[in-house]
């Protein structure tokens, strides 16, 4: 039975001429990830094979970079890059899991216009949250004087998008050469370089088992 879920960055937008990171994570399964394919419709963008490393399609070699993690960085974006992107996890024994990301590439002026309205809006939202949180803290402190209260700040909540697929919002993209992992330790890739190793790492916490910086490793997780 396939128990895993794919967490993705969901619907994203980027500016023409800029770059974007496409990210997926597989969680809630103990299946072994053998390969991850990145596709745009029927066009292959890249593959990361657990034994053989990265293969970037010749059609995209000049503007696709592997990583960070199992993700893919799309550079020099054009309006024609707008559309659906798929991450396909090949696993054993589960089979394949597919995640979907919709990318919209905006003209520079549109993106800037959007940003001008977004920044004050975000500021207002943040201020409102601060007021609400302060009120809650005061109320709780008054009612539970003797109990210590730990407030957990959760950045990048996962919200169910559809069966077997979730949206994932990374708080900040990790740089190439580092491990990208969500708290539940979904399957990921470490410090990859094109053509280098994506060898499976059975022990997620055994950081010392990385052979060298620049190797990329699949993680088997028990999320």
């Amino acid at each position: 039975m396939m128990t895993g879920t794919i967490e993705t960055t969901g619907n994203i937008s980027a500016e023409k001429g800029g770059s974007i990171i496409l990210q997926c994570h597989l969680s809630s399964t103990t299946a072994q990830v053998t390969q991850v394919n990145w596709e745009q419709q029927d066009q292959l963008l890249a593959i990361c094979n657990a034994d053989l490393g990265w293969h970037i399609s010749p059609s995209f070699k000049d503007r696709v970079a592997p990583g960070p993690g199992l993700g893919l960085t799309l550079q020099s974006l054009t309006v024609n890059d707008t559309g659906e992107y798929f991450c396909i996890y090949h696993t054993y024994p589960d089979g394949t899991y597919t995640g979907r990301i919709f990318l919209e590439v905006l003209e520079s002026s549109v993106a800037e216009h959007g940003a001008r309205f977004q920044i004050p809006l975000l500021g207002a939202m943040a201020a409102t949250l601060v007021v609400i949180c302060t009120a809650v803290i005061v109320v709780v402190a008054l009612t539970r004087k003797k109990k210590a209260l730990r407030i957990h700040s959760v950045e990048g909540d996962l919200r169910r998008k559809s069966a077997g697929q979730e949206e994932w919002s990374p708080s900040a993209p990790s740089p190439p050469g580092s491990c990208v992992q969500a708290e539940a330790a979904p399957a990921g890739l470490c410090g990859e370089q094109r053509g280098e190793d994506c060898a499976e790492l059975h022990d997620y916490f055994n950081v010392l088992s990385y052979r060298s910086l620049g190797n990329c490793s699949f993680f088997t997780e028990t999320g």
Partner: antibody, heavy 120, light 107 residues
Framework: EVQLQESGPGLVKPSETLSLTCAVS????????WNWIRQPPGKGLEWIGY???????YYNPSLKSRVTISRDTSKNQFSLKLSSVTAADTAVYYC??????????????WGQGTTVTVSS | DIVMTQTPLSLSVTPGQPASISCRAS??????IAWYQQKPGQSPKLLIY???YRYTGVPDRFSGSGSGTDFTLKISRVEAEDVGVYYC?????????FGGGTKVEIK
């Protein structure tokens, strides 16, 4: 120029183990990946498996229980062992090189092949 | 495993005329297709990778196209030296699998 040369006994008895070696010259086996493929008489190609530059192996599930691919980097060669052979294993066996980074799973340097007959 | 089906099984072509070989995958394989030529008594040689990219030294009369499940190898003007068996291969997922082959003969 990279050259691959298969070698091994041309005749193997049923139930025995077929052993072949592929000698690689003009290139170090510490990069790329190295495949075995076979072709029964008058038939098509069947991919057996590979060994990667790091020594990791993958075998065709249809043969997995009987196949072992290993390498000797000091001699710049890799080997195929196929156990419990039957007449159905009679074929021309090829070794081939792949560069996953540039060509994915396409194999671009092939040996000339060696014929193995399984018969008592 | 992904099954690759080639058509036709054999093809007889007049020199200078075009030839077309089809390959169909049992499931979508994006553009992860290679084509090989095997001349009589020789080992296979890579012609095309990533569905449409000619390998080094391959004459430009050979071209590949397609994505998803349907792929085509075309020879724009067949020459006598093109006789042999042509195979498609997928590397979308392991195990890599080959088509059954198409035999090209000269009329």
């Amino acid at each position: 120029e990279v050259q691959l040369q298969e070698s091994g006994p041309g005749l193997v008895k049923p139930s025995e183990t077929l052993s072949l070696t592929c000698a690689v010259s003009g290139y170090s086996m510490t990069s790329d990946y190295w495949n075995w493929i076979r072709q029964p008489p008058g038939k098509g190609l069947e991919w057996i498996g590979y060994i990667s530059y790091s020594g990791r192996t993958y075998y065709n599930p249809s043969l997995k229980s009987r196949v072992t691919i290993s390498r000797d980097t000091s001699k710049n060669q890799f080997s195929l062992k196929l156990s419990s052979v039957t007449a159905a294993d009679t074929a021309v066996y090829y070794c081939a090189r792949g560069d996953y980074s540039n060509y994915g799973g396409a194999m671009y340097d092939w040996g000339q092949g060696t014929t193995v007959t399984v018969s008592s | 495993d992904i099954v690759m089906t080639q058509t036709p099984l054999s093809l007889s072509v007049t020199p200078g005329q075009p030839a077309s070989i089809s390959c169909r995958a049992s499931q979508g394989v994006s553009t992860t297709i290679a084509w090989y030529q095997q001349k009589p008594g020789q080992s296979p040689k890579l012609l095309i990778y990533s569905a449409s990219y000619r390998y080094t030294g391959v004459p430009d009369r050979f071209s590949g196209s397609g994505s998803g499940t349907d792929f085509t190898l075309k020879i724009s003007r067949v020459e006598a030296e093109d006789v042999g068996v042509y195979y498609c291969q997928q590397y979308y997922s392991s195990p890599f699998t080959f088509g059954g082959g198409t035999k090209v003969e000269i009329k």
